[in-house]
């Protein structure tokens, strides 16, 4: 059962796993949610009746029954983890805590103009977990405007104390706001020879990389595969760090793989969700339950639905036994990973999918695309919406993309002459315009947010957000697309598609069926040569064939330029302007979404 509200002046008795320090009960709940075993917590707020050494303590708790006895205690705030909830979860914490000093290892001290600048510095520093900033009013003159960057083994403070005229806060890496590079490559036959901060068992290098990503101290990793010569180290995932933030030595070793934390790209790839099945593989751990199941998929479902289950092993039924049902072993461990991994015993193992909700919904794999042809099929581009105006008569106005359950990203130039959001309708999950009838359900638009620097499409800033009146329930035919990570600025996308119901050639009419075209990206330098009378800025991105023929066209404005990278679709561009329908063989010009990620997050996360 999902319980989101906090219980004031209440303490849960027993079940302690560990104690951490957090600046608020709300953040204690987040820490509990992300901890592999925590189901409940008790936080102690500052209070005259409470011992100051216990202020800001966050006790993480577990219980076989998923609940614990409650005791009344002033200043105690208790609650449940969000593990039991189905809604999207984020570790992003933008709060600034006034007059609190969050203790940790102060590894960097510098002058900053503001707390915001200090927070940005922390976000863009590979080691930083949180910071404390001494304001202009701080009593000690030499410490004023000092920004202390801090880290700890757990990523949370080692202590929190009251201190006048300072402010503290966390790195915004988990808010997708870091400018640090996103290095997705996994290097085969490579060992990073740096200090290990932890080690866990993992079935493959991808899981190892994802574990590294959500481990607070891990910057890179080395994984020893099941063919590794030393038996005791097979399937071992070594989580590593270094002072420089990069591996100091790379050693060539067969059957080992190494890679980097994906902290700077975690909003656009799954880092918690280990969805694969591992055949002829047994995961060992503490046994939670043994249940009969028809298949390994059914076993995974059982594990996902059991809140304490972290991983499972399924042993298929022996012929005609138990109505063809096999045994499903639901398991857990102290760190969420198997204590040992064995091969050759015939089991099929995997992980709970409960953690998938900690990843962005946009990272979910969609059904395979139909290659070739120009007409799309249902569910192929589930983020694509058709934006209609009802004035003077109802018609398709522009395309757009679902980026959140209440947010559509589109082009600013679509709203020329649109006086009010009341005349707009957003239709999602649509393949053919002819499906839209009087009684077709739509989303009303609560607010149009146009970039305040927008003047005309050709000058840039051609970006707008639509806040919907109601939320979108994600299904196979309507779900969000990932925004590109700022750390992905240097990625070269090779699988890009433009979609929309726009005209296929000049003076054509709107198409009934959603059209698609695969188009290559063109460098801005090349694009500038083709548009000599217009400035192609770094906030624009160009795409289109040299020989013409395939391009976005009028009516596709505001729609997505979607690029697939590492099996995840990213909204790389918004159809903005260009020579029109490829007749002059010019590339189309798109709003370069990665340059507006901060703006999008600022607008969509505003309280």
């Amino acid at each position: 059962e999902c319980v989101t509200q906090l219980l004031k002046d209440t303490c849960f008795e027993g079940g302690d796993i560990t104690t951490v320090f957090t600046p608020s009960a709300k953040y204690c709940q987040v820490v509990c949610t992300y901890h592999p075993r925590c189901l409940l917590f008790t936080f102690t707020a500052e209070s005259p009746s409470e011992d100051p050494t216990r202020w800001f303590t966050c006790v993480l708790k577990d219980s076989v029954t998923e609940t614990l006895p409650r005791v009344n205690r002033t200043a105690a705030i208790s609650g449940y983890s969000f593990k039991q909830c189905s809604h999207q979860i984020s570790a992003c914490n933008k709060d600034i805590y006034v007059d609190l000093d969050m203790k940790g290892i102060n590894y960097n001290s510098s002058v900053a103009k503001s707390a915001q600048e200090c927070q940005e510095r922390c976000t863009d520093d590979v080691h930083c977990h949180f910071f404390t900033y001494a304001t202009r009013q701080f009593p000690s003159l030499e410490h004023r405007n000092i920004c202390l960057l801090k880290h700890t083994q757990t990523g949370t403070p080692t202590r929190i104390t009251k201190l006048d005229k300072v402010v503290s806060g966390f790195s915004l890496k988990s808010c997708a706001l870091s400018n640090l590079a996103c290095i997705r490559d996994i290097f085969p036959n490579t060992v990073f020879a740096d200090s290990n901060i932890d080690s866990v068992m993992a079935p493959d290098a991808f899981v190892c990389g994802r574990i590294c990503t959500h481990h607070p101290g891990c910057l890179f990793f080395t994984f020893f595969s099941q063919e590794w010569p030393k038996e005791s180290q097979r399937n071992l995932c070594l989580l590593k760090t270094s002072e420089s933030g990069l591996p100091s030595t790379r050693i060539k070793k067969s059957k080992a793989l190494s890679g980097f934390s994906l902290q700077s790209c975690r909003h656009s790839i799954p880092v918690f969700c280990h969805s694969s099945f591992y055949h002829d593989t047994d995961f060992l751990g503490e046994e939670l339950d043994i249940v009969a199941a028809k298949s390994h998929e059914a076993c995974q479902k059982l594990c996902t639905n059991a809140v304490r289950c972290q991983f499972f092993t399924y042993t298929p039924a022996q012929a005609s036994c138990n109505e063809g049902k096999g045994k499903c072993y639901l398991k857990l461990s102290s760190n969420g990973s198997p204590t040992k991994i064995l091969h050759g015993r015939g089991g099929i193992s995997g992980y709970t999918l409960r953690l998938c909700k900690m990843d962005n919904e946009c990272t979910t794999k969609i059904k395979p695309r139909i290659v070739g042809g120009t007409a799309s099929v249902r569910g192929e581009w589930p983020w694509q919406v058709t934006l209609h105006t009802t004035s003077p008569t109802q018609r398709h106005l522009c395309g757009g993309s679902i980026i959140g359950n209440q947010w559509i990203l589109t082009a600013a130039h679509c709203f020329y002459g649109v006086e009010s959001p009341k005349i707009l309708r957003v239709y999602s999950g649509i393949l053919n315009q002819s499906e839209i009838k009087e009684d077709t359900s739509f989303f009303g638009v609560q607010e149009i947010i146009i970039h305040d620097q927008y003047k005309m499409a050709e000058s840039g800033y051609d970006i707008a957000l639509l806040k919907l009146e109601t939320t979108v329930n994600y299904t196979d035919s309507q779900r969000p697309i990932c925004l590109p990570s700022k750390g992905d600025r240097n990625v070269i996308y090779t699988d890009c598609w433009v979609t929309g119901w726009g005209y296929r050639k000049l003076r054509d009419k709107i198409q009934n069926t959603l059209q698609k075209a695969k188009i290559p990206l063109v460098t801005n330098e090349e694009c500038q040569k083709r548009y000599r009378g217009h400035k192609i800025t770094h906030k624009m991105i160009c795409a289109g064939y040299r020989e013409g023929g395939k391009d976005a066209c009028k009516g596709d404005s505001g729609g997505p330029l979607s690029c697939k990278h590492n099996e995840v679709w990213h909204l790389v561009g918004i159809t903005s302007w260009g020579e029109g329908c490829a007749q002059r063989e010019r590339p189309g010009v798109y709003t370069n979404v990665v340059e507006y990620v901060d703006w999008i997050l600022e607008k969509t996360q505003a309280v």
Epitope: H534, E547, G578
Partner: antibody
Framework: QVQLQQSGAELVRPGTSVTVSCKAS????????IEWVNQRPGQGLEWIGV????????NYNENFKDKATLTADTSSSTAYMQLSSLTSDDSAVYFC?????????????WGQGTSVTVSS | DIVMTQTPKFLLVSAGDRVTITCKAS??????VAWYQQKPGQSPKLLIY???NRYTGVPDRFTGSGYGTDFTFTINTVQAEDLAVYFC?????????FGGGTKLEIK
Amino acid sequence: QVQLQQSGAELVRPGTSVTVSCKASGYAFSNYLIEWVNQRPGQGLEWIGVINPGSGYTNYNENFKDKATLTADTSSSTAYMQLSSLTSDDSAVYFCARTYGKYGGAMDFWGQGTSVTVSS
Amino acid sequence: DIVMTQTPKFLLVSAGDRVTITCKASQSVSNDVAWYQQKPGQSPKLLIYYISNRYTGVPDRFTGSGYGTDFTFTINTVQAEDLAVYFCQQDYSSPPTFGGGTKLEIK
């Protein structure tokens, strides 16, 4: 109908500057690019640069970067080209032209040309 | 910069003849080629754009063809008023560049 009316012929001294104007009429001035092209006596055509009157954006041929400055005044629908530090090499007929498409393309209307002679 | 090499430089023809001028680009310019006519003492006039599209009011004796790097401009039945210099121009990549011109003279 579309017309581009250029200023009259100029006889100027070396080292000085000259400004050639090009007044547009018969169309929406801000919606089309204005190009400048020169033609030295008995020679071919050479592109100098372009101005987008709608945005004020200019783009120059490398050979004319330090020679020509393009501006446009949308209120009077007039484009200007200033040529500086003139030498006898700059003696030529200078044309303004409108592009056929909003984003560039062939030049469909031309001014009558302005002859600039640099002589001491 | 893309170089447009135009041949021949001069053409001496009789009225009624068929005239062909060629233009070769130093790299592919796709379909972005235009042809202009410049009569003595006048400014250039656009005849053909996008290789083969005749501009408004241009007689159908003027035609263009080609693609990529090789382009041809043809006057099917030359008339006395066609005495002029003809230029090709690429508009594919900035800076736009012109061919050296072909001077057409009538015998």
